[in-house]
Interface confidence: low
C-alpha cells in the first residue's frame, strides 16, 4: 500500500508539473480535476502545490493561479466569477466530459475561495478503504 501511495503521488506530481503544457494530452489533468472537484480539495498536500507550475503563472503579478476545479462554489458569492468563469468549466467536470482542449485555469485573488485542503489525505483514506 505504501508503494501504491508513493506511485500515486509520483503520478500526481507529474500531472501537476505538466498541467496545461500539452493541449492534446489532457486525460490525466481531467482525472485530477475530477478528483479535486469530487473530494473538495486542491493540490497534493496543499493548494500551494500549484503555485510554482509555470503554465499557471500570472504575468509577474502576485495573483497565483490554480485549476478551476480547486474553487469552492458554495463559498463563492461573486456571481461574475461563477457565471462567466467557473460554472461553465466545472459543468464539464460534473459530466465527466472528455472534450476539453486546454487546461481550465482560474486566478486566485487575495481573498479567494479555493479548497484549503490538499487531496493526499482523502485519497489515502480512499486507498485504505478499498
Amino acid at each position: 500500500r505504501a508503494q501504491l501511495e508513493r506511485s500515486l503521488r509520483d503520478v500526481v506530481e507529474k500531472t501537476i508539473q505538466k498541467y496545461g503544457t500539452n493541449p492534446e494530452e489532457t486525460a490525466a489533468e481531467e482525472s485530477w480535476d475530477y478528483v479535486q472537484f469530487q473530494l473538495r480539495c486542491c493540490g497534493w498536500h496543499y493548494p500551494q502545490d500549484w503555485f510554482q507550475v509555470l503554465i499557471l503563472r500570472g504575468n509577474g503579478s502576485e495573483a497565483h493561479r490554480v485549476p478551476c476545479s480547486c474553487y469552492n462554489l458554495s463559498a463563492t458569492n461573486d456571481s461574475t466569477i461563477l457565471d462567466k468563469v467557473i460554472l461553465p468549466q466545472l459543468s464539464r467536470l460534473g459530466h465527466l466530459a472528455r472534450s476539453r482542449h486546454s487546461a481550465d485555469i482560474c486566478a486566485v485573488p487575495a481573498e479567494s475561495h479555493i479548497y484549503r485542503e490538499g487531496c493526499a489525505q482523502g485519497l489515502q483514506k480512499w486507498l485504505h478503504n478499498n
Epitope: 506530481e13 498536500h45 500551494q48 502545490d49 503555485f51 510554482q52 487575495a110 481573498e111 479567494s112
Partner: antibody, heavy 116, light 110 residues
C-alpha cells in the same frame, strides 16, 4: 512585499515583539516563517505560522518565541533575550510544494541587538 | 530536529569554472530540500526547490540534485555575480514540521 519592524537595542531579559507587515497577498493563503542571522553567521530557522494560524517552532525556540498574526501582519514575540539572540530577523513568505517548503519572498530584515 | 551539514565552508573558483556544494541531512528528508543564495547586506534569494526544481527566472547554470540524505548544488559557467554564500534548507511539512538550514558555503569567484 514583506517588511519587518521592531528591531532595536535591548538589555538582556527584556521582551521584544517584531512585526512583519505584508502587502500584495493574503495571509489567509500563505504560511509565514521567521529566520534569523547573527552577525557574520548563517541562517537559523525559528518557526512558522501557517495560513490557519497553527504555529511550529524549532526545538531551541519553543517557549521563548511565539508567532501570531492578524489579517495583514505577523508578529514574533521574544522573551528572556540574551546576547546570543543578537541577529537580523527575517520574515519570509513560505510556499509549499508536495510536502516540502521554501521561502520565496523575504523582507530586508530587522536588527535586534541584546547588550547590557 | 534534523541537522543539515554543508561542505565545503568556502570554495574559490575562476570565472567560467564549476562549483559543487554538498548538503547532508541527519535523517531521510526525501526531496524536501531548497537552496538559497545570499549576498552581503541582502536577504536570501531562493534558487532551487524540491531538491532539483528551478524557480522561474533562475539561471539554468544552477542545478540541484539528490534525495534522501545527500544533496548537491552545482553552479556551472561561474560568473562574478555568483559570488555569494549559499545555504541548503530542509523543509519537510508532510507529517511533522521539520525545518533547518545548513551552515552555508561561501563561493568566491576569482
Amino acid at each position: 512585499s514583506v517588511e519587518e519592524s521592531g528591531g532595536r537595542l535591548v538589555t538582556p531579559g527584556t521582551p521584544l515583539t517584531l512585526t512583519c507587515t505584508v502587502s500584495g497577498f493574503s495571509l489567509s493563503n500563505y504560511n509565514m516563517g521567521w529566520v534569523r542571522q547573527a552577525p557574520g553567521k548563517g541562517l537559523e530557522w525559528i518557526g512558522v505560522i501557517d495560513a490557519s494560524g497553527t504555529t511550529y517552532y524549532a526545538t531551541w525556540a519553543k517557549g521563548r518565541f511565539t508567532c501570531s498574526k492578524t489579517s495583514s501582519t505577523v508578529e514574533l514575540k521574544m522573551t528572556s533575550l540574551t546576547t546570543e539572540d543578537t541577529a537580523t530577523y527575517f520574515c519570509a513568505r513560505e510556499l509549499l510544494y508536495f510536502g516540502s517548503s521554501y521561502y520565496d519572498l523575504w523582507g530586508q530584515g530587522t536588527l535586534v541587538t541584546v547588550s547590557s | 530536529d534534523v541537522v543539515m551539514t554543508q561542505t565545503p565552508a568556502s570554495v574559490s573558483e575562476p570565472v567560467g569554472g564549476t562549483v559543487t556544494i554538498k548538503c547532508q541531512a541527519s535523517q531521510n528528508i526525501d526531496s524536501n530540500l531548497a537552496w538559497y543564495q545570499q549576498k552581503p547586506g541582502q536577504p536570501p534569494k531562493f534558487l532551487i526547490y524540491y531538491a532539483s526544481n528551478l524557480p522561474f527566472g533562475v539561471s539554468s547554470r544552477f542545478k540541484g540534485s539528490g534525495s534522501g540524505t545527500q544533496f548537491t548544488l552545482t553552479i556551472s559557467d561561474l560568473e562574478s555575480a555568483d559570488a555569494a554564500t549559499y545555504y541548503c534548507q530542509c523543509a519537510d511539512v508532510g507529517s511533522t514540521y521539520v525545518a533547518a538550514f545548513g551552515g552555508g558555503t561561501e563561493v568566491v569567484v576569482k
